[in-house]
Every structure is written in C-alpha cells, then in structure tokens.
Interface confidence: medium
C-alpha cells in the first residue's frame, strides 16, 4: 500500500512531508509488554493480535525483546524515532524489516528493533542473514 497520499492537508495525523506528499500514520502491532516463548530462534512472530493506527504519521513500529532469570517478554508499540525508547536511539527506523540489535542492560538480555512498514514488528529477526527466510 503506498505510504504517501498525493495531496497535502492541514491535519496533524495526515502530515505533509517536505515533498508536499502526505504520509498516513503507520499500522503497527501494539500489545505493549507480553510474555513470549521466542528464544534461541533466528526469527519470531509477535503473536500480537492488536494492530494500532499510530498516533502521529512519523511514528514507526518498535519491538523490544527482553530475557532475564524470570521470564522472556516481547513489547510491541508505535514510537517517534526522534525520541529515545528505553533510553536508546531507534536505529534503522526507516527499515522495512524489524532486525533486532542487542543493547547493553544490566541484569537482562535486551534486544530492540524499529521498522517502517505495515505491521513490520509482527515478524522480528535476530539474524540478518535470515531476513528472507520464513519465521521458525
């Protein structure tokens, strides 16, 4: 589906970009934090049945995978790439795929990815060499 609208409008949620086209807000999986069975896999599905129309047109899809000695969780949200999330910059916010990058956090294993395609945080990838393969 084309990400830009061929008309400019004066609405906060159909914002004009520099070229005069209008960007619709993104569609992202948005289940906040949920327990996950995703572990030691090259890729995983979010198993989130909720899709959000993001609040603002520049927001992107984000997924955060965390593992500690108690559990594994997967967080799916919309977020503004200009702002940090959990204290980290959103890398690859323009990427069509959600490729996880490890972040240093005390007491847990922490991976985060961002992407800018419809529901792209539904399929999270831990190994870039497997980006064209099916989820395990």
């Amino acid at each position: 589906i084309p990400p830009h609208v061929p008309k400019s409008v004066n609405s906060d949620v159909m914002a004009s970009d520099n070229g005069g086209a209008v960007k619709l807000p993104q569609l992202c999986k948005f289940c906040d934090v949920r327990l996950s069975t995703c572990d030691n896999q090259k890729s995983c599905m979010s198993n989130c049945s909720i899709t959000a129309i993001c609040e603002k047109p520049h927001e992107v899809c984000v997924a955060v995978w965390r593992k500690n000695d108690k559990n594994i969780t997967l967080e799916t949200v919309c977020h503004d790439p200009k702002l940090t999330y959990h204290g980290f910059t959103l890398e690859d916010a323009a990427s069509p795929k959600c490729v996880m990058k490890e972040k240093k956090r005390a007491g847990e294993t922490f991976f985060m990815c961002a992407c800018n395609m419809e529901e792209c945080n539904d399929y999270i990838i831990f190994s870039e060499e497997y980006t064209t393969s099916s989820p395990d």
Partner: nanobody
Framework: EVQLLESGGGLVQPGGSLRLSCAAS????????MYWVRQAPGKGLEWVSA????????YYADSVKGRFTISRDNSKNTLYLQMNSLRAEDTAVYYC?????????????WGQGTLVTVSS
C-alpha cells in the same frame, strides 16, 4: 470514552454498491482525520481511505480509487464510505478508525467492524 460504530455492510453481488457509515462519539470528531481500513479473510489490515478533519482532503488506496468515495458529516459525527462497482476482492471486515485506534483483529473491539461480502 471513544466509540466508533460501523454499519452498512452485507452481501452484495459483483458490480453492486454499498454505503458504510461510522457513528463516532467521545472525541472532537471535526478535529480528527478519519480512516477506513479493511481486513480480508486470512490477511492483514489494509488502508482503504482517509479524510482530513475538514473533509477537504482525501486519500484512496490504488485498489479502490475511482470506485470508493469517503465523506464525513461533522454535524452528525458520522463518517461514510460509498462503495461502487464492488469486486470479490473487496470482501473484508471494514473498520473506521482515528489515529490511536487499536484494532483487535479476529475479535470484537469498541469499533467492531462491518462485514462486506461480494459474491454472486
């Protein structure tokens, strides 16, 4: 509390027409861009159409351009989608939404969607 209630779906033959309505409450309707999205059986959500708060600007997915018309009546807090020349591939659950809407796919949610079935 935001509420969106879609209606107007049903069974229609290919080439036929339907008009969907969405009654909105719980927010300042005239200040919000509004959207129609759809979910075909076994598929993800797809943008259909969008309209600015004033109604002055509209967007249509390529797949519906020239066949569907989005409109709104801010005095009635109602969003519309006129669907003409319907095709089998238009069969889907249609949801109206505003930004921030969370659509729980496969389940009821506060805007429960309306099913459009195009079949002979």
């Amino acid at each position: 509390e935001v509420q969106l209630l879609e209606s107007g779906g049903g069974l229609v033959q290919p080439g036929g027409s339907l008009r969907l309505s969405c009654a909105a409450s719980g927010f300042t309707f005239g200040q919000e861009s509004m959207y129609w999205v759809r979910q075909a059986p076994g598929k993800g959500l797809e943008w259909v159409s969008a309209i600015s708060g004033s109604g002055g600007s509209t967007y249509y997915a390529d797949s519906v351009k020239g066949r569907f018309t989005i409109s709104r009546d801010n005095s009635k807090n109602t969003l519309y989608l006129q669907m003409n020349s319907l095709r089998a591939e238009d069969t889907a659950v249609y949801y109206c939404a505003k930004s921030g809407t969370r659509i729980k796919q496969g389940f009821d949610y506060w805007g429960q969607g309306t099913l459009v079935t195009v079949s002979s």
